[in-house]
Protein backbone atom coordinates (compact mmCIF):
# COMPACT_ATOMS: atom_id res chain seq x y z
CA UNK A 1 0.00 0.00 0.00
CA UNK A 2 1.11 3.53 -0.76
CA UNK A 3 0.89 6.34 1.77
CA UNK A 4 -0.94 9.25 0.18
CA UNK A 5 -0.37 12.58 1.83
CA UNK A 6 -2.47 15.68 1.35
CA UNK A 7 -1.70 19.28 0.53
CA UNK A 8 -4.16 21.78 1.89
CA UNK A 9 -5.33 24.98 0.21
CA UNK A 10 -7.55 27.38 2.13
CA UNK A 11 -9.08 29.83 -0.33
CA UNK A 12 -11.90 32.35 -0.45
CA UNK A 13 -15.02 32.26 -2.59
CA UNK A 14 -14.34 33.64 -6.05
CA UNK A 15 -10.65 32.74 -6.03
CA UNK A 16 -8.93 30.26 -8.35
CA UNK A 17 -7.26 27.03 -7.28
CA UNK A 18 -4.24 26.46 -9.51
CA UNK A 19 -2.28 23.22 -9.07
CA UNK A 20 0.00 21.04 -11.15
CA UNK A 21 0.19 17.25 -11.20
CA UNK A 22 3.55 15.76 -12.15
CA UNK A 23 3.66 12.55 -14.22
CA UNK A 24 6.21 10.29 -15.90
CA UNK A 25 6.69 11.69 -19.40
CA UNK A 26 7.65 8.47 -21.15
CA UNK A 27 4.74 6.48 -19.76
CA UNK A 28 1.88 8.93 -19.62
CA UNK A 29 2.39 11.90 -21.96
CA UNK A 30 -0.54 11.05 -24.23
CA UNK A 31 -2.64 9.18 -21.66
CA UNK A 32 -6.03 10.54 -20.72
CA UNK A 33 -5.94 12.38 -17.40
CA UNK A 34 -8.68 13.42 -15.01
CA UNK A 35 -9.48 15.56 -11.99
CA UNK A 36 -11.55 13.79 -9.35
CA UNK A 37 -13.24 14.60 -6.07
CA UNK A 38 -13.35 12.08 -3.24
CA UNK A 39 -16.33 12.37 -0.93
CA UNK A 40 -16.75 10.49 2.33
CA UNK A 41 -18.15 7.02 1.76
CA UNK A 42 -18.23 7.39 -2.01
CA UNK A 43 -16.16 6.38 -4.99
CA UNK A 44 -13.91 9.08 -6.47
CA UNK A 45 -16.00 11.08 -8.92
CA UNK A 46 -14.49 12.36 -12.17
CA UNK A 47 -15.21 16.04 -12.65
CA UNK A 48 -13.19 16.68 -15.80
CA UNK A 49 -10.83 14.83 -18.09
CA UNK A 50 -8.51 15.52 -20.97
CA UNK A 51 -9.18 14.13 -24.40
CA UNK A 52 -8.10 10.66 -25.41
CA UNK A 53 -5.31 10.73 -26.39
CA UNK A 54 -4.44 13.77 -24.35
CA UNK A 55 -3.36 16.70 -26.48
CA UNK A 56 -0.36 18.86 -25.64
CA UNK A 57 -1.04 22.33 -24.20
CA UNK A 58 -4.67 22.06 -25.24
CA UNK A 59 -7.02 23.51 -22.61
CA UNK A 60 -10.20 21.65 -21.83
CA UNK A 61 -12.89 23.31 -19.73
CA UNK A 62 -15.71 21.59 -17.92
CA UNK A 63 -17.78 24.13 -16.07
CA UNK A 64 -15.40 25.98 -13.76
CA UNK A 65 -12.59 23.46 -14.18
CA UNK A 66 -9.81 23.90 -16.73
CA UNK A 67 -7.29 21.16 -17.51
CA UNK A 68 -4.13 21.71 -19.53
CA UNK A 69 -1.75 18.85 -20.21
CA UNK A 70 1.81 19.98 -20.90
CA UNK A 71 3.61 16.99 -22.41
CA UNK A 72 6.91 18.83 -22.64
CA UNK A 73 6.83 19.52 -18.89
CA UNK A 74 5.19 16.28 -17.77
CA UNK A 75 2.57 18.29 -15.93
CA UNK A 76 -1.20 18.38 -15.85
CA UNK A 77 -2.33 21.84 -14.77
CA UNK A 78 -5.69 22.06 -13.04
CA UNK A 79 -7.52 25.28 -12.37
CA UNK A 80 -10.84 25.63 -10.59
CA UNK A 81 -12.12 29.15 -11.06
CA UNK A 82 -14.68 31.19 -9.14
CA UNK A 83 -14.53 28.82 -6.19
CA UNK A 84 -17.63 28.24 -4.09
CA UNK A 85 -17.89 27.04 -0.49
CA UNK A 86 -19.43 23.80 -1.74
CA UNK A 87 -16.27 23.07 -3.74
CA UNK A 88 -14.53 22.23 -0.46
CA UNK A 89 -13.31 18.65 -0.45
CA UNK A 90 -10.54 16.23 -1.29
CA UNK A 91 -9.30 16.13 -4.89
CA UNK A 92 -6.82 14.12 -6.91
CA UNK A 93 -5.31 13.88 -10.37
CA UNK A 94 -5.40 10.46 -12.02
CA UNK A 95 -4.18 8.94 -15.26
CA UNK A 96 -6.43 6.46 -17.02
CA UNK A 97 -4.67 3.26 -18.03
CA UNK A 98 -7.28 0.66 -19.04
CA UNK A 99 -7.73 -2.11 -18.20
CA UNK A 100 -5.90 -1.26 -14.98
CA UNK A 101 -7.26 1.12 -12.41
CA UNK A 102 -6.36 4.79 -12.75
CA UNK A 103 -2.87 5.77 -11.65
CA UNK A 104 -3.06 8.37 -8.87
CA UNK A 105 -0.69 11.30 -8.98
CA UNK A 106 0.65 12.54 -5.66
CA UNK A 107 -0.42 14.35 -3.57
CA UNK A 108 -4.12 14.77 -2.97
CA UNK A 109 -5.45 18.30 -2.55
CA UNK A 110 -7.56 19.21 0.47
CA UNK A 111 -9.46 22.30 -0.65
CA UNK A 112 -11.18 24.47 1.93
CA UNK A 113 -13.22 27.33 0.51
CA UNK A 114 -14.60 29.95 2.89
CA UNK A 115 -16.83 32.97 2.41
CA UNK A 116 -15.18 36.33 2.53
CA UNK A 117 -13.30 38.99 0.67
CA UNK A 118 -11.06 37.26 -1.86
CA UNK A 119 -8.51 39.92 -2.64
CA UNK A 120 -6.95 43.22 -1.72
CA UNK A 121 -7.88 46.63 -3.10
CA UNK A 122 -6.35 47.02 -6.52
CA UNK A 123 -5.62 43.34 -6.91
CA UNK A 124 -5.52 42.15 -10.47
CA UNK A 125 -6.89 38.78 -11.48
CA UNK A 126 -7.39 39.41 -15.17
CA UNK A 127 -4.78 36.89 -16.30
CA UNK A 128 -7.19 34.05 -15.70
CA UNK A 129 -10.51 35.84 -15.64
CA UNK A 130 -10.30 36.92 -19.28
CA UNK A 131 -10.21 33.31 -20.38
CA UNK A 132 -13.72 32.56 -19.19
CA UNK A 133 -15.39 35.41 -21.06
CA UNK A 134 -14.55 33.99 -24.47
CA UNK A 135 -17.39 32.23 -26.31
CA UNK A 136 -16.34 28.60 -26.13
CA UNK A 137 -16.78 25.82 -28.62
CA UNK A 138 -18.03 22.55 -27.18
CA UNK A 139 -17.34 18.96 -28.07
CA UNK A 140 -18.03 15.61 -26.46
CA UNK A 141 -15.42 13.44 -24.76
CA UNK A 142 -15.49 10.29 -22.74
CA UNK A 143 -14.60 10.57 -19.07
CA UNK A 144 -14.30 7.08 -17.61
CA UNK A 145 -15.85 6.57 -14.21
CA UNK A 146 -13.73 5.27 -11.36
CA UNK A 147 -16.02 2.41 -10.43
CA UNK A 148 -13.97 -0.50 -9.16
CA UNK A 149 -15.81 -2.13 -6.24
CA UNK A 150 -12.44 -2.98 -4.71
CA UNK A 151 -11.25 0.60 -4.49
CA UNK A 152 -11.18 2.36 -1.13
CA UNK A 153 -14.60 3.95 -0.79
CA UNK A 154 -14.00 6.19 2.18
CA UNK A 155 -12.11 9.44 2.00
CA UNK A 156 -8.94 9.37 4.07
CA UNK A 157 -8.52 11.31 7.27
CA UNK A 158 -6.94 14.75 6.99
CA UNK A 159 -3.39 13.49 7.27
CA UNK A 160 -2.72 10.29 5.36
CA UNK A 161 -4.44 7.18 4.08
CA UNK A 162 -3.46 3.80 2.74
CA UNK A 163 -4.69 3.40 -0.78
CA UNK A 164 -4.26 0.27 -2.84
CA UNK A 165 -4.59 0.09 -6.60
CA UNK A 166 -5.45 -3.44 -7.75
CA UNK A 167 -5.97 -4.13 -11.42
CA UNK A 168 -9.55 -4.09 -12.59
CA UNK A 169 -11.81 -2.92 -15.40
CA UNK A 170 -12.99 0.66 -15.78
CA UNK A 171 -16.49 1.57 -16.80
CA UNK A 172 -16.26 3.92 -19.79
CA UNK A 173 -19.87 5.03 -19.77
CA UNK A 174 -19.85 8.61 -18.59
CA UNK A 175 -20.08 11.32 -21.26
CA UNK A 176 -19.16 14.84 -20.23
CA UNK A 177 -19.46 18.13 -22.09
CA UNK A 178 -15.99 19.45 -22.79
CA UNK A 179 -15.32 23.09 -23.57
CA UNK A 180 -12.12 24.13 -25.30
CA UNK A 181 -10.81 27.50 -24.24
CA UNK A 182 -7.99 29.50 -25.79
CA UNK A 183 -5.09 30.30 -23.49
CA UNK A 184 -3.60 33.73 -22.97
CA UNK A 185 -0.12 34.12 -21.55
Amino acid sequence: ATKLTEEKYELKEGQTLDVKCDYTLEKFASSQKAWQIIRDGEMPKTLACTERPSKNSHPVQVGRIILEDYHDHGLLRVRMVNLQVEDSGLYQCVIYQPPKEPHMLFDRIRLVVTKGFSGTPGSNENSTQNVYKIPPTTTKALCPLYTSPRTVTQAPPKSTADVSTPDSEINLTNVTDIIRVPVFN
Epitope: L11, V19, L25, F106
Partner: antibody, heavy 119, light 108 residues
Protein backbone atom coordinates in the same frame (compact mmCIF):
# COMPACT_ATOMS: atom_id res chain seq x y z
CA UNK B 1 10.94 13.77 10.10
CA UNK B 2 11.93 15.43 6.85
CA UNK B 3 15.63 16.19 6.60
CA UNK B 4 17.78 17.67 3.84
CA UNK B 5 21.54 17.83 4.19
CA UNK B 6 23.72 19.65 1.68
CA UNK B 7 27.42 19.01 1.18
CA UNK B 8 30.15 19.69 -1.34
CA UNK B 9 30.61 23.42 -0.85
CA UNK B 10 34.01 25.04 -0.52
CA UNK B 11 36.38 27.52 -2.06
CA UNK B 12 37.18 27.37 -5.77
CA UNK B 13 38.84 29.64 -8.29
CA UNK B 14 36.91 31.34 -11.10
CA UNK B 15 36.42 28.90 -13.94
CA UNK B 16 36.55 25.94 -11.57
CA UNK B 17 33.95 23.29 -10.78
CA UNK B 18 32.12 21.93 -7.75
CA UNK B 19 29.49 19.27 -7.24
CA UNK B 20 26.94 19.83 -4.50
CA UNK B 21 24.92 16.99 -2.99
CA UNK B 22 21.73 17.00 -0.97
CA UNK B 23 20.89 13.84 0.95
CA UNK B 24 17.26 13.63 1.97
CA UNK B 25 15.19 11.48 4.31
CA UNK B 26 11.72 11.44 5.81
CA UNK B 27 9.68 11.48 2.60
CA UNK B 28 9.37 9.59 -0.66
CA UNK B 29 12.08 11.43 -2.56
CA UNK B 30 11.15 10.22 -6.05
CA UNK B 31 7.66 11.73 -5.86
CA UNK B 32 8.69 15.32 -5.37
CA UNK B 33 10.30 18.08 -7.35
CA UNK B 34 13.43 19.50 -5.76
CA UNK B 35 15.15 22.84 -6.23
CA UNK B 36 18.40 24.57 -5.49
CA UNK B 37 18.08 28.11 -4.14
CA UNK B 38 21.06 30.31 -3.37
CA UNK B 39 21.74 33.35 -1.24
CA UNK B 40 24.75 35.60 -1.79
CA UNK B 41 26.27 37.01 1.42
CA UNK B 42 23.96 39.68 2.83
CA UNK B 43 21.58 39.37 -0.13
CA UNK B 44 18.19 37.86 -0.87
CA UNK B 45 17.09 34.47 -2.16
CA UNK B 46 17.60 33.43 -5.79
CA UNK B 47 16.11 30.28 -7.31
CA UNK B 48 18.78 28.40 -9.27
CA UNK B 49 17.41 25.13 -10.65
CA UNK B 50 14.58 22.64 -10.35
CA UNK B 51 14.15 18.97 -11.18
CA UNK B 52 10.67 17.50 -11.22
CA UNK B 53 9.95 14.20 -9.50
CA UNK B 54 8.00 11.97 -11.85
CA UNK B 55 8.72 13.70 -15.15
CA UNK B 56 12.36 14.45 -14.45
CA UNK B 57 12.01 17.78 -16.26
CA UNK B 58 14.77 20.26 -15.43
CA UNK B 59 14.77 24.05 -15.33
CA UNK B 60 17.47 26.66 -14.75
CA UNK B 61 17.78 30.34 -13.97
CA UNK B 62 19.25 32.30 -16.87
CA UNK B 63 22.25 33.21 -14.72
CA UNK B 64 23.40 29.57 -14.53
CA UNK B 65 22.03 28.06 -17.75
CA UNK B 66 24.69 26.13 -19.64
CA UNK B 67 27.03 26.06 -16.64
CA UNK B 68 25.06 24.21 -13.95
CA UNK B 69 23.42 20.79 -14.21
CA UNK B 70 20.85 19.45 -11.78
CA UNK B 71 20.36 15.70 -11.37
CA UNK B 72 19.03 13.21 -8.87
CA UNK B 73 19.55 9.61 -7.86
CA UNK B 74 16.27 8.33 -6.51
CA UNK B 75 17.88 5.09 -5.34
CA UNK B 76 20.21 7.11 -3.11
CA UNK B 77 17.66 9.77 -2.15
CA UNK B 78 20.14 12.39 -3.29
CA UNK B 79 19.91 15.58 -5.34
CA UNK B 80 22.98 17.00 -7.09
CA UNK B 81 24.11 20.28 -8.60
CA UNK B 82 27.14 20.14 -10.89
CA UNK B 83 28.58 23.64 -11.15
CA UNK B 84 31.07 24.37 -13.92
CA UNK B 85 32.72 27.58 -15.15
CA UNK B 86 32.14 29.14 -11.77
CA UNK B 87 32.15 32.90 -11.46
CA UNK B 88 32.77 35.23 -8.52
CA UNK B 89 29.06 36.13 -8.57
CA UNK B 90 28.16 32.48 -7.90
CA UNK B 91 29.49 32.89 -4.36
CA UNK B 92 26.58 32.08 -2.07
CA UNK B 93 25.03 29.67 0.37
CA UNK B 94 23.31 26.99 -1.69
CA UNK B 95 20.17 25.46 -0.23
CA UNK B 96 18.34 22.43 -1.51
CA UNK B 97 14.61 22.57 -1.02
CA UNK B 98 11.75 20.11 -1.30
CA UNK B 99 8.76 21.34 -3.24
CA UNK B 100 5.07 20.81 -2.76
CA UNK B 101 3.67 18.11 -5.01
CA UNK B 102 1.12 20.50 -6.45
CA UNK B 103 3.17 23.68 -6.91
CA UNK B 104 6.72 24.99 -6.90
CA UNK B 105 6.84 26.34 -3.39
CA UNK B 106 9.40 25.15 -0.90
CA UNK B 107 8.11 23.50 2.25
CA UNK B 108 11.38 22.04 3.53
CA UNK B 109 14.91 23.42 3.28
CA UNK B 110 18.36 22.17 4.10
CA UNK B 111 20.74 24.25 6.18
CA UNK B 112 22.82 25.16 3.14
CA UNK B 113 26.41 24.78 1.98
CA UNK B 114 28.69 27.73 1.27
CA UNK B 115 30.34 28.07 -2.14
CA UNK B 116 33.06 30.69 -2.40
CA UNK B 117 34.47 31.58 -5.82
CA UNK B 118 37.57 33.68 -5.45
CA UNK B 119 41.01 34.05 -6.98
CA UNK C 1 10.36 36.89 -15.81
CA UNK C 2 7.94 37.97 -13.10
CA UNK C 3 9.51 40.57 -10.84
CA UNK C 4 8.50 40.60 -7.18
CA UNK C 5 8.84 43.86 -5.24
CA UNK C 6 8.54 44.02 -1.46
CA UNK C 7 7.94 47.05 0.71
CA UNK C 8 9.13 48.44 2.94
CA UNK C 9 12.75 47.27 2.89
CA UNK C 10 12.86 47.60 6.67
CA UNK C 11 9.99 47.74 9.14
CA UNK C 12 10.58 48.87 12.73
CA UNK C 13 7.92 47.57 15.08
CA UNK C 14 7.55 47.21 18.82
CA UNK C 15 6.77 43.80 20.32
CA UNK C 16 3.02 43.27 20.55
CA UNK C 17 2.29 45.59 17.64
CA UNK C 18 0.94 44.66 14.24
CA UNK C 19 3.26 44.39 11.24
CA UNK C 20 2.04 44.66 7.65
CA UNK C 21 4.36 43.65 4.82
CA UNK C 22 3.59 44.14 1.13
CA UNK C 23 4.57 42.25 -1.98
CA UNK C 24 3.76 43.28 -5.53
CA UNK C 25 4.10 41.17 -8.69
CA UNK C 26 4.94 42.70 -12.08
CA UNK C 27 2.06 40.68 -13.56
CA UNK C 28 -0.80 38.69 -12.14
CA UNK C 29 0.20 35.48 -10.36
CA UNK C 30 -3.36 34.56 -9.29
CA UNK C 31 -2.91 33.29 -5.70
CA UNK C 32 0.36 31.50 -6.51
CA UNK C 33 2.38 33.26 -3.86
CA UNK C 34 4.29 32.10 -0.79
CA UNK C 35 5.84 33.88 2.18
CA UNK C 36 9.00 32.74 3.97
CA UNK C 37 10.69 33.79 7.20
CA UNK C 38 14.46 33.73 7.55
CA UNK C 39 16.41 34.33 10.73
CA UNK C 40 20.16 35.05 10.73
CA UNK C 41 22.24 31.94 10.10
CA UNK C 42 19.17 29.82 9.35
CA UNK C 43 17.45 28.48 6.28
CA UNK C 44 14.16 30.07 5.20
CA UNK C 45 10.94 28.65 6.63
CA UNK C 46 7.64 28.44 4.74
CA UNK C 47 4.93 30.52 6.43
CA UNK C 48 2.11 31.04 3.93
CA UNK C 49 1.31 29.60 0.50
CA UNK C 50 -1.53 30.03 -1.94
CA UNK C 51 -1.47 33.64 -0.72
CA UNK C 52 -3.44 32.82 2.43
CA UNK C 53 -2.95 29.22 3.59
CA UNK C 54 -0.79 28.86 6.69
CA UNK C 55 1.86 26.16 6.47
CA UNK C 56 1.93 23.36 9.03
CA UNK C 57 2.86 24.57 12.50
CA UNK C 58 2.68 28.29 11.72
CA UNK C 59 0.95 30.32 14.46
CA UNK C 60 -2.38 32.01 13.75
CA UNK C 61 -0.87 35.47 14.25
CA UNK C 62 0.55 35.11 10.73
CA UNK C 63 -1.96 35.72 7.96
CA UNK C 64 -1.71 36.33 4.24
CA UNK C 65 -4.10 37.99 1.82
CA UNK C 66 -4.30 39.24 -1.72
CA UNK C 67 -4.47 37.92 -5.24
CA UNK C 68 -3.36 38.97 -8.69
CA UNK C 69 -0.55 41.46 -8.18
CA UNK C 70 -0.97 42.78 -4.62
CA UNK C 71 -0.26 40.67 -1.53
CA UNK C 72 0.04 41.31 2.18
CA UNK C 73 1.57 39.40 5.07
CA UNK C 74 0.24 40.47 8.45
CA UNK C 75 1.70 39.57 11.83
CA UNK C 76 -1.07 40.53 14.25
CA UNK C 77 1.00 40.82 17.43
CA UNK C 78 4.76 40.62 17.01
CA UNK C 79 6.60 38.25 19.28
CA UNK C 80 10.34 38.41 19.93
CA UNK C 81 10.90 35.37 17.70
CA UNK C 82 9.19 37.09 14.74
CA UNK C 83 11.97 39.61 14.15
CA UNK C 84 13.52 38.33 10.95
CA UNK C 85 13.63 38.85 7.18
CA UNK C 86 10.50 37.94 5.20
CA UNK C 87 10.46 37.00 1.52
CA UNK C 88 7.61 36.53 -0.93
CA UNK C 89 7.90 34.11 -3.86
CA UNK C 90 5.72 33.54 -6.91
CA UNK C 91 5.13 30.06 -8.31
CA UNK C 92 2.84 30.92 -11.22
CA UNK C 93 3.15 29.16 -14.58
CA UNK C 94 6.72 28.03 -15.26
CA UNK C 95 10.19 28.78 -13.94
CA UNK C 96 12.01 30.93 -13.13
CA UNK C 97 10.49 31.10 -9.68
CA UNK C 98 11.25 34.53 -8.31
CA UNK C 99 11.55 36.02 -4.84
CA UNK C 100 11.10 39.53 -3.57
CA UNK C 101 14.18 41.28 -2.21
CA UNK C 102 12.97 40.82 1.36
CA UNK C 103 11.60 42.93 4.21
CA UNK C 104 13.54 43.09 7.44
CA UNK C 105 11.32 43.33 10.51
CA UNK C 106 13.36 44.82 13.33
CA UNK C 107 12.69 45.84 16.92
CA UNK C 108 11.68 49.46 17.31
Amino acid sequence: EVQLLESGGGMVQPGGSLRLSCAVSGFTFSRYAMSWVRQAPGKGLEWVSEMRGSSGSTYYADSVKGRFTISRDNSKNTLYLQMNSLRVEDTAIYYCAKEFSSNSLFDYWGQGTLVTVSS
Amino acid sequence: EIVMTQSPATLSVSPGERATLSCRASQSVNINLAWYQQKPGQAPRLLIYGASTRATGIPARFSGSGSGTEFTLTISSLQSEDFAVYYCQQFYNWPPWTFGQGTKVEIK
